[in-house]
């Protein structure tokens, strides 16, 4: 099968959502764990992740088309501690499949704003911490 992983981000007021999306067929879901790592260039694993999600086959979904499963990690208020390099990953030990998303970064600036760079889905997102807007 063809399984892939993408990274995205969204802002809701002061909250920043980091989203890992795995695209897969219904029957490919079981056995997969999706996880988000920070500052783990070489050893991103479920054990070292910020958050993980085990996928389950949804019996309510008909057909064999591609579906998506999402892991969302929410930062309620971005601070300098959140600056760093993030990566969305997924793996199935059962199938021996490992997916590693592109690295993306959060940079907290001295002015109290932050930028998220390196996202392939929504190219370069800039967030104004004070204004609460997406620019």
């Amino acid at each position: 099968g063809c399984i892939n992983i993408t990274s995205s981000a969204s802002q809701e007021g002061t909250r920043l959502n980091l989203i890992c999306t795995v695209w897969h067929k219904k029957e490919e879901a079981e056995g997969f764990v999706v996880f988000l790592c920070k500052d783990r260039s070489g050893d991103c694993s479920p054990e070292t992740s910020l958050k993980q999600l085990r996928l389950k086959r949804d019996p309510g979904i008909d057909g064999v088309g591609e579906i998506s499963s999402q892991l969302m990690f929410t930062i309620s208020q971005v601070t300098p501690l959140h600056s760093g390099t993030y990566q969305c990953c997924a793996r199935s030990q059962k199938s021996g499949i490992r997916l590693q998303g592109h690295f993306f970064s959060i940079l907290f600036t001295e002015t109290g704003n932050y930028t998220v760079t390196g996202l392939k889905q929504r190219q370069h997102l800039e967030f104004s911490h004070n204004e609460g807007t997406l620019s």
Partner: antibody
Framework: QVNLQESGPGLVQPSETLSLTCTVS????????INWFRQPPGKGLEWMGT???????DYNSALKSRLTISRDTSKSQVFLKMNSLQTEDTAIYFC??????WGQGASVTVSS | DIRMTQSPASLSASLGETVSIECLAS??????LAWYQQKPGKSPQLLIY???SLQDGVPSRFSGSGSGTQYSLKINSLESEDAATYFC?????????FGSGTKLEIK
């Protein structure tokens, strides 16, 4: 149909290097990873290491210093190399697609 | 390393009976547990993964349950072909580790 077949020397001298090949069919090594396991005579199973679909590897820390797993995707082959063999490395060596489909195993005896 | 303690080491049961095999992990493995069946001279066959998910093609008389550190494999309505050794495997953490096996004999 998924098939895995291990092949190797059968008999290895102590202190020498073991080279095993796992030849697969019915799937692509770029889509699925391969685990190596072994089972000493009359004993339980031991996980040795994994080569993932993307070519990355993970090893059992107890064997890492003398174990290398590699692959040739164009030939649908995965290779296990383990050096400094001792008699306690005598076992049946299995390759498996992930944790699902296993080969029949290759018997390896370490003896002089 | 996570130690997997499997019990019993062996058991004998009659056709049609129900048997259970236990595996106890030395720490929480979050349901990351598989069960295998192995017959003499053959390679292991995956029966159950993620503690309770039945592998495709495996008869429904096999079932798995458990969470945390305690897991079990249940075989209902034993058939002669179920005579084999059964192993558990945790894939929660490296290195992956197996239980020592349970040899099932059919009377």
């Amino acid at each position: 149909q998924v098939n895995l077949q291990e092949s190797g020397p059968g008999l290895v001298q102590p202190s020498e290097t073991l080279s095993l090949t796992c030849t697969v069919s019915g799937f692509s090594l770029t889509n699925y990873g391969i685990n190596w396991f072994r089972q000493p005579p009359g004993k339980g199973l031991e996980w040795m290491g994994t080569i993932w679909n993307d070519g990355g590897t993970d090893y059992n820390s107890a064997l890492k210093s003398r174990l290398t797993i590699s692959r040739d995707t164009s030939k649908s082959q995965v290779f296990l190399k383990m050096n400094s063999l001792q008699t306690e490395d005598t076992a049946i060596y299995f390759c498996a697609r992930g944790m699902e489909a296993w080969g029949q195993g290759a018997s390896v005896t370490v003896s002089s | 390393d996570i130690r997997m303690t499997q019990s019993p080491a062996s058991l004998s049961a009659s056709l049609g009976e129900t048997v259970s095999i236990e595996c106890l992990a030395s720490e929480d493995i979050y349901k990351n547990l598989a069960w295998y069946q192995q017959k003499p001279g053959k390679s292991p066959q995956l029966l159950i993964y993620y503690a309770s998910s039945l592998q495709d093609g495996v008869p429904s008389r096999f079932s798995g349950s458990g969470s945390g550190t305690q897991y079990s494999l249940k075989i209902n309505s034993l058939e002669s072909e179920d005579a084999a050794t059964y192993f558990c495997l945790q894939d929660s953490e490296y290195p992956l580790t197996f239980g020592s096996g349970t040899k099932l004999e059919i009377k």
